[in-house]
């Protein structure tokens, strides 16, 4: 039977390396061993190339391109095709489409004034045009309390954030995930980071416990392990 | 050693053809673009087309389109330049030069940075 | 396509003086920041053109840095600083950012 796509491609950029263009077949595919999308930069001498796609379901394909640094005048010339038939041709520009990389190295370190504080990377080198637009989304959620979740907006410049352990229920296991967006890019937000999870132990001021006691008693206690949430 | 030696300049009559050749050698030359810029006894450089690494891309000057055709064979290492229909303003020398890194996803640009000696085209009856 | 236009058509100028040449192009040739598809050749009389400037400002391998090129979307210079006797000759722009790809007229250099 004939091969169509019955949701066309959908394509974001990191703006930096990769482009990922993803799209739904009207009906289970090989993508691999079925399709090509061809891509192909409008820029004088620019040569055509090809993506072999993979699938990320049945019916759903997805396509990594490999691209240059980009900059905003960059349009690629996007062709899908099955064998010799072309199913859709489109043109994509990577500055229009953004979505920012996801930040790494989520950790969580007790600091003074009974506080946690939060640390991340910034996904982009420093002379990256998305370095300095990034601001983030903190999320933080009570492992056994799925009503006890808190988010936190960081757009100031640092990849960091404090938060008051007495704003955390003591005693009780919490994970933070943080994601990124570039606000004058227009971007869509990157995936979350893998969680970080540590035991929040806070003894109210009243019990007069020294700081020393407190954090010797966080430090024990504190530890963090990594898994993924995806985002969708 | 970057060279390129055009070959094929002759005196042809006005209708004629004419092949030229630029055999490059001293750089990978799969990967680059190259061009082919012509000048008019006492004039100035004009630009008549470009061909892309690969040879899948080509490019050509509104004066020589339809009429004159590029291509490359890159296991010889060498550029052509297929010239038909000629007229007496295709009087010229003729320079073949390295253009722009073709490789890469977005063509990395050093200008046209090494140029043949030339060949003398002559079209008179 | 773009027009290339180069002033002036001739110019003289004594050993050690600097010399001025400037390109305007009818469209912008600014891809994006520090990309300025201008180019600077020079030709001596009976010699092949010999590439000076690229991308607007970058010097071209083993290019004096007497030689330098500035300005950026359709207006561009080039300078020739403490000029010598070696330096006459005819210099030409070009524009390398679409196809057809244009030079300026030229611009005759002579030493006094």
């Known amino acids: 039977g004939s091969v169509k796509v019955l949701h066309e491609p959908s394509c974001f950029s990191d703006y930096i390396s990769t482009s990922v263009c993803q799209w739904k077949m009207d009906h289970p595919t090989n993508c691999s061993a079925e399709l090509r999308l061809s891509y192909q930069l409008d820029f004088m001498g620019s040569e055509n190339h090809t993506c072999v796609p993979e699938n990320r379901e049945d019916s759903v394909c997805v396509c990594s391109m490999p691209i240059d640094d980009a900059v905003e005048a960059d349009v690629y010339q996007l062709d899908l095709w099955a064998g010799q038939q072309l199913l859709w041709s489109g043109s994509f520009q990577p500055s229009k489409h953004v979505k920012p990389r996801t930040p790494g190295n989520l950790t969580v370190h007790p600091n003074i004034s009974h506080t946690w504080l939060l640390m991340w990377t910034n996904p982009y080198p420093t002379e990256n045009h998305l370095h300095s637009e990034l601001t983030y989304m903190v999320n933080v959620s009570n492992d056994n309390d799925p009503e006890d979740f808190k988010v936190y907006n960081v757009t100031y410049m640092g990849p960091t954030l404090r938060l008051a352990a007495s704003t955390l229920k003591s005693g009780a296991s919490y994970s933070a995930r943080v994601r990124a967006w570039a606000q004058t890019y227009n971007s869509t937000w990157s995936d979350w980071s893998p969680s970080t999870t540590w035991l929040n132990y806070y003894e109210p001021w009243e019990q007069h416990l020294g700081l020393n006691d407190i954090f010797e008693a966080q430090k024990i206690e504190w530890h963090e392990h990594h898994h993924h949430h995806h985002h969708h | 050693e970057v060279q390129l030696v055009e070959s094929g300049g002759d005196l042809v009559k006005p209708g004629g053809s004419l092949r030229l050749s630029c055999v490059a050698s001293?750089?990978?030359?799969?990967?680059?673009?190259m061009t082919w810029v012509r000048q008019a006894p006492g004039k100035g450089l004009q630009w008549l087309s470009l061909?892309?690494?690969?040879?899948?891309?080509?490019y050509y000057a509104d004066a020589v389109k339809g009429r004159f055709t590029i291509s490359r064979d890159n296991a010889k290492n060498t550029l052509y330049l297929q010239m038909n229909s000629l007229r007496a303003e295709d009087t010229a020398v003729y320079y073949c030069?390295?253009?722009?890194?073709?490789?890469?996803?977005?063509?990395?640009?050093?200008?046209?940075?090494?140029w043949g000696q030339g060949t003398l085209v002559t079209v008179s009856s | 396509d773009i027009v290339m236009t180069q002033t002036p058509l001739s110019l003289s100028v004594s050993p050690g003086e600097t010399a001025s040449i400037s390109c305007r192009s009818s469209q912008s040739l600014t891809y994006s920041i520090g990309y300025n598809y201008l180019d600077w050749y020079m030709q001596k009389p009976g010699q092949s053109p010999q590439g000076l400037i690229y991308?607007?400002?970058k010097r071209a391998s083993g290019v004096s840095d007497r030689f330098s090129g500035s300005g950026s979307g359709a207006d561009f210079t080039l300078k020739i600083s403490r000029v010598e006797a070696d330096d006459a000759g005819v210099y030409y722009c070009m524009q390398g950012l679409q196809s057809p790809l244009g030079f300026g007229q030229g611009t005759k250099l002579e030493i006094k």
């Open positions: 001293g750089f990978p030359f799969r990967d680059y673009a």
């Open positions: 061909i892309s690494g690969s040879g899948g891309k080509t």
């Open positions: 030069a390295v253009d722009r890194l073709t490789k890469t996803i977005r063509p990395q640009y050093y200008g046209l940075w090494h």
């Open positions: 991308l607007g400002s």
